[in-house]
């Protein structure tokens, strides 16, 4: 049998015309039923009964998942991060071949030197993080190695990350043109050969909240769109109130379909009220218009 | 666990003469780099005298001609000998050593150090 939804109706309006009971549990279309036990409900838009109630997908809610909710969760990560594959060549360090086990003691020695190096290089920069070598090779040593870069996610991180990556190809280019041999011998930390920089890679995280809220939104990926507050992007639908893209529906009720946000007006005891945003009454009484 | 043990270090009259010897344990001289820093009062730390195991040496300007620098490997030993000694002489004298070959005068570049020796030169 079919479940007995309690549903309490006010009389709205659709600013198309039509009357319309809220919330809109269609009592008069047949639904699927899904039975569990003596239960059953009527859980639309893929949504299950799990003994209780209905358990709604995304972008739904509500007895039956028959309404579509305002805003969505949208979780940026905390941080985002960026992975610059670099190669400087180290002259002040002969080549052997020890160097190319990660476990040798040579290994250990030659990182934590190249480690502090680079920590000294890059120190002016808040989103370092650090070095990682890869690979080192003869030459004397070609360190080929990912400098890290995180920053706290605001709309504006790949700028961040962006204007960073350039800080650090201009802080490797100065340090490998300026601690070089002399006859032989090196007085900084590390000696590099000049020419040995390059940049081979960025990597760059992505994170697109627009691209997040469309997926989320599915069939009404149209409809919603992403504002920020306080550098936080929230998903929301026109019938979200408090945002620049909110609707006021004035004397009457933010529903969305598929065809977007609609106004469902109000019928009060001694008014009517119309038009797209709700907003022209009309005194059952007099027939006056309020404007 | 790397260790260096440094000794003959003590008080000369200037023109004198002194051998410092540095003992190690934990790797072999076949191997990487050797040599000896000082450090004089108020003053940073200074290369002296570097070895790498492929031949490479470095004498400090104030010091070729004078101090020569040179290894045992059948007793793990480096050795600093200190001719015709300098007032400017006096300082510690340290013994440092790295697993990698090494070009540099940086102390900061040498990872494995002694506890130091001191030499003073006075009349």
């Known amino acids: 049998p079919l479940a007995t939804i309690p549903v309490s109706t006010t009389s709205l309006t659709s600013s198309e015309g039509s009357t319309i009971s809220t919330p809109s549990v269609d009592i008069s279309t047949p639904v699927t039923t899904s039975i569990v036990g003596d239960q059953c409900s009527r859980c639309k838009n893929g949504g299950f009964w799990d003994g209780l109630k209905c358990q709604c997908l995304t972008p739904y809610y509500g007895e039956s998942c028959e309404e579509v909710v305002n805003s969505i969760d949208i979780a940026p990560p905390e941080t985002v991060s960026a992975q610059m594959e670099l190669t400087v060549t180290v002259t002040s360090v002969k080549f052997t071949d020890e160097l190319k086990n990660h476990s040798s003691q040579e290994f250990r020695e030659f990182n934590k030197t190249f480690t502090e190096q680079m920590n000294i290089v890059y120190s002016g920069i808040p989103e370092y993080v650090g070095v990682n070598i890869t690979n080192l090779r003869l030459g004397s040593v070609v360190v080929e190695h990912d400098v890290l870069l995180r920053t706290k996610y605001t709309p504006e991180y790949k700028t961040a990350l962006d204007n960073a990556t350039e800080v650090v190809k201009q802080k490797i280019t100065k340090v490998t043109t300026e601690q070089i041999m002399t006859n032989d011998n090196c007085s900084a930390l590390m000696c590099f050969n000049t020419t040995g920089t390059q940049v081979q890679n960025i990597t760059v995280t992505q994170y697109d909240p627009v691209e997040e809220c469309r997926q989320k939104a599915e069939e009404y990926e149209d409809y919603f769109l992403v504002e920020y507050r306080d550098q936080k992007p929230y998903c929301i639908s026109p019938c979200e109130s408090g945002f620049n893209a909110s609707k006021n529906c004035n004397h009457g009720k933010c529903q969305m379909s598929q065809n977007g946000a609609r106004c469902l007006c109000v019928t009060t005891e001694t008014h009517w009220y119309s038009g797209e945003d709700c907003n022209q009454g009309t005194q059952k009484s007099h027939h006056h218009h309020h404007h | 666990e790397v260790q260096l043990v440094e000794s003959g270090g003590g008080v000369v009259q200037p023109g004198g003469s002194l051998r410092l010897s540095c003992a190690a344990s934990?790797?072999?001289?076949?191997?990487?780099?050797w040599g000896w820093f000082r450090q004089a009062p108020g003053k940073e730390r200074e290369a002296v005298a570097l070895?790498?195991?492929?031949?490479?040496?470095f004498y400090a300007d104030s010091v070729k001609g004078r101090f020569t620098i040179s290894q045992d490997n059948s007793k793990n030993t480096l050795y600093l000998q200190m001719n015709s000694l300098r007032a400017e002489d006096t300082a510690v004298y340290y013994c440092?050593?790295?697993?990698?070959?090494?070009?540099?005068?940086?102390?900061?570049?040498?990872?494995?150090w002694g506890q130091g020796t001191m030499v003073t030169v006075s009349s």
């Open positions: 440092a050593a790295s697993v990698l070959v090494l070009r540099t005068l940086n102390p900061k570049a040498w990872h494995h």
């Open positions: 934990g790797f072999t001289f076949s191997r990487g780099s």
């Open positions: 070895i790498s195991s492929d031949g490479w040496t």
